[in-house]
C-alpha cells in the first residue's frame, strides 16, 4: 500500500497556504481526488508530488494515491480542509441526478472541520426541507438525501453556521428520476385496416411511461406525420394520444403506420399496415388439397380460410351427395377469427362413415357477393376379395373378385395342401395379374376389379388363393377343391371356403 | 497494463437509440473517474461528462447535459454511454477516457457513431 | 468554437524546433494546469504533457509544456516524421467545471 505524507488522515491548512502532498509506493504511483483539480502533479522519481503555492477552498477535498502496479489494488488517501472564513463550502458539482430510491450526495464539502456541529440542509431561499426527508452529512464528502424520491427534485443549499450567522453554499440542483423499467408502453390500434376508397378511417397511436419525459409519433411510410398530441396523467403513467382522422380515403393514405415512442432507455415502435381497396372483396382459400382422400373410419378436418372487407354477412357448410341427403352437423362446424379481416373455418368430420363420401361445400356472403369452396371427399377402403370356380368357353377358371379404393393389385398363388392362408414354405407358384379387369369405378365409390385364372386340372390336395392389396390394407380368399376330378364338374359341385 | 476497449462502430437512423460501452481493465475501476469525449468530423474535441463508476456520481458538460446518459456497471467494469433518439448531428467519434485531476490519461480507441436516414 | 484558441496548422522540417500555442482566461489556464494531447491519425489520443510540463513515461524528452498567465506552450525539438499528427491543449475550466479543449493544431513535417 502506498504511503502519504504527511501521515495524517486529514490535513487543516489556511488560504494561501503552501500545500506538498507527497505519495511514495514500491513502484510508480498516481494521485487522483475530485474532478476539478487546482494543483500542480509532479513526479520525483518512485514518489509522485500533488502541490499548490496558493492553495483555496476549491482544494478542500479527499485525495488518494494508489500503487496500479499492486494486483491488490491497495491506495492510501488524505482529506485536506483549506478553513476560508468566507467559504466554508467547496461544491463539487451545481447539479446532481439519480434516480428514485437511490441516494443522493449533494457533493457541498465543508472546508472547516470545526463547523460540522453546525451544518444543515435547507431548500434554496430558505425554505425547510419537505417532510420525510431523511439525510446525512458528512463533512469529507457533503449531504446525503437517502433514498430521494421524485418530488425531492429541489434546489438546495448547504448551510453552517459561522460566528452565529448562518452561510450558505452555491445552489445544488437535484433531479429525481422515476426509475424507467423501459421504453414507454405503446398501442396502436387497429393492427390493420382495410377500407374501400371514401370510406372514413381512424388510427390512434398511444403511448404511456411512468415519467413525461418522451416523445412519440406517427409515421406513413417513413413520413412523420404532423398530427396534434394529447396528453393525460392517470393510474400514476402520463400518456400521450396521436389520432389520425381520415375522412375520405384513398390510395395514397395506404402503407404501413408505425407508432414510435423513445425515452432515455431507448425506443420502442410498432407498426400496422392499411390496405385501401376499390370495392369489397371476399376470397376464399385452403391450405388442404382440395381432393382429399381418407381412410374410411377416420376423422378429418376441412379448413377454409376467409379473407373479406365488409364483414361476412353469412356462411354455412353444405353437403352435395352423392349418397344421401344429410347435412352436415351444425355442432361440427367451428369458426375461428385470426383477426379483423381473416377468419377460418373448420367442418370436423369424426369416424368417417362410407355414406359421408362425395362433396363439401363452404359458402360465404358478403357485400362483395356469395363464393364457394367446395372440397372432393373420397374414402379410402381395404380390398375385400371373394372367388367362384366357373367354365368360361369351356376351360376351366377362377374367378376373383376385388372390391376397395385405391384400385387393388391381384396375386394369385397356388401352394400345396388344405390352407386359409398360403404361406411362403407351400407355396408352388405365384401369378401377378398386372392388368385384372375393372369391372365398376364411380366416383367416391369403391373401384371393383376381377381377376381370372384358368386351371386344366384342380388338384385337390393344393389351395388356390387371391390375394388383393392397396395402400389400405390387403384381402384374400383360399379357394380348397374337395373331390377329386374336379375339372370336369360344373363349380356348384365344389365346396370352398372364404 | 491500463486499457479502455470500446464497442465498435454504429449505423443507425434518426430516431433510433443506441447504448456504446467502453471497458477498462488493468486499473482499480471503481477509484478513477471515466469521461467521454465527442470529435465531430473535421472538428476539435468536446468533453461531454464523466462519471465516478464506484458510486456512480455523475457530471455532464451543460452542453450535453439532458442529450446523453453516461453509465456504468462495475461488475464488468464497463462504462457507457447512451441515446434514446439520435440525430444526423451526432455522427461522431465519440471517445472513453481515463480522467485523473483534471486530465485524461489513458483514451480508449474511438466508437464511430453514423446517423443517416 | 472552442474555448481555448490554437492555430489551426504549424509546420516544420525534420530536426527544426517548433512551438504550438494555446490561450485561455482566467476561469481556465489562469487557474488550472494545462495538458496537451496528440492524435496521430487512425490512432487513440495519447496525453502527451499534463500539470503544464510533466511528461507521462514513454513520451520523449522532445516534447516539453510551459504555461505563463493565461497562456501556454508545447515545444516540439528535433522534429521527427513521426510527429506529424494533430495537438490539442486542455485544461479545467471552473466555470464549466469541466475540461475544455482547444480547437487542435495540426502539425505537418514537411
Known amino acids: 500500500i502506498p504511503v502519504i505524507e504527511p501521515s495524517v488522515p486529514e490535513l487543516v491548512v489556511k488560504p494561501g497556504a503552501t500545500v506538498t502532498l507527497r505519495c511514495v509506493g514500491n513502484g510508480s504511483v498516481e494521485w487522483d481526488g475530485p474532478p476539478s483539480p487546482h494543483w500542480t502533479l509532479y513526479s520525483d522519481g518512485s514518489s509522485s508530488i500533488l502541490s499548490t503555492n496558493n492553495a483555496t477552498f476549491q482544494n478542500t477535498g479527499t485525495y488518494r494515491c494508489t500503487e496500479p502496479g499492486d494486483p491488490l489494488g491497495g491506495s492510501a488517501a488524505i482529506h485536506l480542509y483549506v478553513k476560508d472564513p468566507a467559504r466554508p463550502w467547496n461544491v463539487l458539482a451545481q447539479e446532481v441526478v439519480v434516480f428514485e430510491d437511490q441516494d443522493a450526495l449533494l457533493p457541498c464539502l465543508l472546508t472547516d472541520p470545526v463547523l460540522e456541529a453546525g451544518v444543515s440542509l435547507v431548500r434554496v431561499r430558505g425554505r425547510p426541507l419537505m417532510r420525510h426527508t431523511n439525510y446525512s452529512f458528512s463533512p469529507w464528502h457533503g449531504f446525503t438525501i437517502h433514498r430521494a424520491k421524485f418530488i425531492q427534485s429541489q434546489d438546495y443549499q448547504c448551510s453552517a453556521l459561522m460566528g452565529g450567522r448562518k452561510v450558505m453554499s452555491i445552489s445544488i440542483r437535484l433531479k429525481v428520476q422515476k426509475v424507467i423499467p423501459g421504453p414507454p408502453a405503446l398501442t396502436l390500434v387497429p393492427a390493420e385496416l382495410v377500407r374501400i376508397r371514401g370510406e372514413a378511417a381512424q388510427i390512434v397511436c398511444s403511448a404511456s411511461s411512468v415519467d413525461v419525459n418522451f416523445d412519440v409519433f406517427l409515421q406513413h411510410n417513413n413520413t412523420k406525420l404532423a398530427i396534434p398530441q394529447q396528453s393525460d396523467f392517470h393510474n400514476n403513467r402520463y400518456q400521450k394520444v396521436l389520432t389520425l382522422n381520415l375522412d375520405q380515403v384513398d390510395f395514397q393514405h395506404a402503407g404501413n403506420y408505425s407508432c414510435v415512442a423513445s425515452n432515455v432507455q431507448g425506443k420502442h415502435s410498432t407498426s400496422m399496415f392499411f390496405r385501401v381497396v376499390e370495392s369489397a372483396y371476399l376470397n376464399l382459400s385452403s391450405e388442404q388439397n382440395l381432393i382429399q382422400e381418407v381412410t374410411v373410419g377416420e376423422g378429418l378436418n376441412l379448413k377454409v380460410m376467409v379473407e373479406a372487407y365488409p364483414g361476412l354477412q353469412g356462411f354455412n357448410w353444405t353437403y352435395l351427395g352423392p349418397f344421401s341427403d344429410h347435412q352436415p352437423e351444425p355442432k361440427l362446424a367451428n369458426a375461428t377469427t385470426k383477426d379483423t379481416y381473416r377468419h377460418t373455418f373448420t367442418l370436423s368430420l369424426p369416424r368417417l362413415k362410407p355414406s359421408e363420401a362425395g362433396r363439401y361445400s363452404f359458402l360465404a356472403r358478403n357485400p362483395g357477393g356469395w363464393r364457394a369452396l367446395t372440397f372432393e371427399l373420397t374414402l379410402r377402403y381395404p380390398p375385400e376379395v371373394s372367388v367362384i370356380w366357373t367354365f368360361i368357353n369351356g376351360s376351366g377358371t377362377l374367378l376373383c373378385a376385388a372390391s376397395g379404393y385405391p384400385q387393388p393389385n391381384v396375386t394369385w398363388l397356388q401352394c400345396s395342401g388344405h390352407t386359409d392362408r398360403c404361406d411362403e414354405a407351400q407355396v408352388l407358384q405365384v401369378w401377378d395379374d398386372p392388368y385384372p379387369e375393372v369391372l365398376s369405378q364411380e366416383p367416391f365409390h369403391k373401384v371393383t376389379v376381377q381377376s381370372l385364372l384358368t386351371v386344366e386340372t384342380l388338384e385337390h390336395n393344393q389351395t388356390y388363393e387371391c390375394r388383393a392389396h392397396n395402400s389400405v390394407g390387403s384381402g384374400s380368399w383360399a379357394f380348397i377343391p374337395i373331390s377329386a376330378g374336379a375339372h370336369t364338374h360344373p363349380p356348384d359341385e365344389f365346396l370352398f371356403t372364404p | 497494463e491500463v486499457q479502455l476497449v470500446q464497442s465498435g462502430a454504429e449505423v443507425k437512423k434518426p430516431g433510433e437509440s443506441l447504448k456504446i460501452s467502453c471497458k477498462g481493465s488493468g486499473y482499480s475501476f471503481t477509484n478513477y473517474w471515466i469521461g467521454w469525449v465527442r470529435q465531430m468530423p473535421g472538428k476539435g474535441l468536446e468533453w461531454m461528462g464523466i462519471i465516478y463508476p464506484g458510486d456512480s456520481d455523475t457530471r455532464y458538460s451543460p452542453s450535453f447535459q439532458g442529450q446523453v446518459t453516461i453509465s456504468a456497471d462495475i461488475s464488468i467494469t464497463t462504462a457507457y454511454l447512451q441515446w434514446s433518439s439520435l440525430k444526423a448531428s451526432d455522427t461522431a467519434m465519440y471517445y472513453c477516457?481515463?480522467?485523473?485531476?483534471?486530465?485524461?490519461?489513458?483514451w480508449g480507441q474511438g466508437t464511430l457513431v453514423t446517423v443517416s436516414s | 468554437q472552442s474555448v481555448l484558441t490554437q492555430p489551426p496548422s504549424a509546420s516544420g522540417t525534420p530536426g527544426q524546433r517548433v512551438t504550438i500555442s494555446c490561450s485561455g482566461s482566467?476561469?481556465?489556464?489562469?487557474?488550472?494546469?494545462v495538458n496537451w494531447y496528440q492524435l496521430l491519425p487512425g490512432t487513440a489520443p495519447k496525453l502527451l504533457i499534463y500539470?503544464?510540463?510533466q511528461r507521462p513515461s514513454g513520451v520523449p524528452d522532445r516534447f516539453s509544456g510551459s504555461q505563463s498567465g493565461t497562456s501556454a506552450s508545447l515545444a516540439i525539438s528535433g522534429l521527427q516524421s513521426e510527429d506529424e499528427a494533430d495537438y490539442y491543449c486542455?485544461?479545467?475550466?471552473?466555470?464549466?467545471?469541466?475540461?475544455?479543449f482547444g480547437g487542435g493544431t495540426k502539425l505537418t513535417v514537411l
Open positions: 477516457a481515463r480522467h485523473r485531476l483534471g486530465f485524461f490519461d489513458y
Open positions: 500539470s503544464n510540463n
Open positions: 486542455a485544461a479545467w475550466d471552473d466555470s464549466l467545471n469541466g475540461p475544455v
Open positions: 482566467s476561469s481556465n489556464i489562469g487557474s488550472n494546469t
